[in-house]
């Protein structure tokens, strides 16, 4: 059976998501990313709130955060373009693109991944799969390798009773079930992929996880689908 | 190095309050959850609660629910837990725990008068 | 809650001996943590997720189980493995220690 990883999850294949990435602070992880183009990363903006004096770097191609593996390459930051709106005390436009040092050397087990640019919602009850290397369990437990989970799309009205996020989710966020299957600390930043295409971006507002009446929240990507493009370009 | 520095031992009286810090250094203590728990001579180990660091969430054993009260301050990377109401019950060794992983060297309470 | 029973609650064994405990949960359980305590000492996280060894521990133990019933198994004894051992479960809530087994060396 499925033990404590992500919440609810278990140990993904090695190198089966070539796009994900940890984005990392003075050589720890801190949250997770997801590589859309060859030398850009998408993240969460509030990852960086507490980074002001640290080294940020991004690593690729990494199913262990120690173990040594070929595919696995730290890239240096030389720009971290958060979205224009984002503010520390909203979960709204939590988004950050990181350029990397260099376009990253692409292979099997680092590829970018495609980013849904339709902007409709997904539909309630599709299954989509966030991975990551956030705590696994309610010990606090952060694992090695990287950990995924598949959770269902809960619709808009459901998320915002005022017993789950009290109307606090806008058209541009989405959310996914929690109930004791969940996204968690260190998996913001992280991909939700619905269908192989990039749909959400795990928010870093302090949630609590595993909890079915607080589900988890993702920016849609294709919501910001100017922004990105205006970034990349 | 990860660590957990724990404040001294405290010798109350009945009825006092007592308030218990512990300091981590080598990490942020706002990246995991921090546990308190609670040691008795004959008596093993039992789980107080915990907090979530990053927002202040905490969790705790229904028992402990009204007796203790769990909070941390990120910005000097301690948590504190107090303890309210003391009887002889209290008498314990506390340990704080990151993740439960790492642990603090304890911190002594003695209840009497 | 979920009441974990540790079994045996004292036992003794010889360097070298193999040595198994069990903790059997109320209901059942995902997974179980092990916690070594030697006197005067703050526990040890042993073993993590059932089976998992935690950094440092050696891996002449090992732990095992599903269910309800869960072991912790050092396979050759040694005069540091005495000490009380702890099992703990984050499955369900309020997250519960067992009573511990105290291990003595003969």
């Known amino acids: 059976p499925p033990r404590g990883r992500i919440l609810g999850g278990r140990e993904a294949e090695a190198h089966a998501r070539p796009y994900m990435a940890s984005v990392q602070l003075n050589g720890a992880h801190l949250c997770g990313g997801v590589l859309v183009a060859e030398q850009w990363v998408l993240s969460a903006a509030h990852c960086l709130e507490d980074a002001a004096d640290g080294k940020v770097q991004v690593l690729l191609g990494a199913h262990s955060l120690s173990q040594p593996e070929p595919s696995k390459r730290l890239y240096d930051v030389l720009r971290a373009v958060p979205h224009p709106d984002s503010q520390p005390d909203t979960i709204d436009h939590d988004l950050l693109l990181l350029q990397l040092s260099e376009k990253a050397t692409l292979g099997p087990a680092v590829r970018p991944l495609p980013w849904q640019r339709v902007d409709r919602d997904v539909a309630p009850g599709t299954l989509c799969d966030v991975a990551g290397w956030g705590i696994v369990n309610h010990a606090g437990r952060r694992p090695d390798s990287l950990q995924h989970v598949l959770l269902p799309v809960l619709d808009r009205a459901t998320c915002n009773r005022r017993t789950h996020h009290d109307g606090a989710i806008t058209e541009r966020l989405m959310c996914a079930e929690s109930n004791r299957r969940d996204s968690c600390k260190g998996d913001s930043g992280g991909p939700l992929v619905c269908g192989g295409v990039l749909e959400g971006v795990v928010t870093s507002g302090s949630r609590v996880c595993g909890n079915r009446k607080k589900p988890g929240i993702y920016t849609r990507v294709a919501s910001y689908a100017a922004w990105i493009d205006s970034v990349l370009a | 190095e990860v660590q957990l520095q724990q404040s001294g031992a405290e010798l109350v009286k009945p009825g006092a309050s007592v308030k218990l810090s512990c300091t981590a250094s080598g990490f942020k203590i706002k990246d995991t959850y921090m546990h308190w728990v609670k040691e008795r001579p004959e008596q093993g180990l039992e789980w107080i609660g915990r907090?979530?660091?990053?927002?202040?969430?905490?969790k705790y054993d229904p028992k402990f629910q009204g007796k203790a009260t769990i909070t941390a301050d990120t910005s000097s990377n301690t948590a504190y837990l107090q303890l309210s109401s003391l009887t002889s019950e209290d008498t314990a060794v506390y340990y704080c725990?990151?993740?439960?992983?790492?642990w603090g060297q304890g911190t002594s309470v003695t209840v009497s008068s | 809650q979920i009441i974990l029973t540790q079994s045996p609650a004292i036992m003794s064994a010889s360097p070298g001996e193999r040595v198994t405990m069990t903790c059997s949960a109320s209901?059942?359980?995902?997974?179980m943590y092990w916690y070594q305590q030697k006197p005067g000492s703050s526990p040890r996280l042993l073993i993590y997720?059932?089976?998992n060894l935690a950094s440092g521990v050696p891996l002449r133990f090992s732990g095992s189980g599903s269910g309800t019933s869960y072991s912790l198994t050092i396979s050759r004894m040694e005069a540091e493995d005495a000490a009380t051992y702890y099992c703990q479960q984050w499955s369900s809530y309020p997250w519960t220690f067992g009573g511990g087994t105290k291990l003595e060396i003969k």
């Open positions: 209901s059942s359980v995902s997974n």
């Open positions: 725990a990151n993740a439960m992983d790492y």
């Open positions: 997720d059932t089976s």
């Open positions: 907090i979530d660091p990053a927002n202040g969430n905490t």
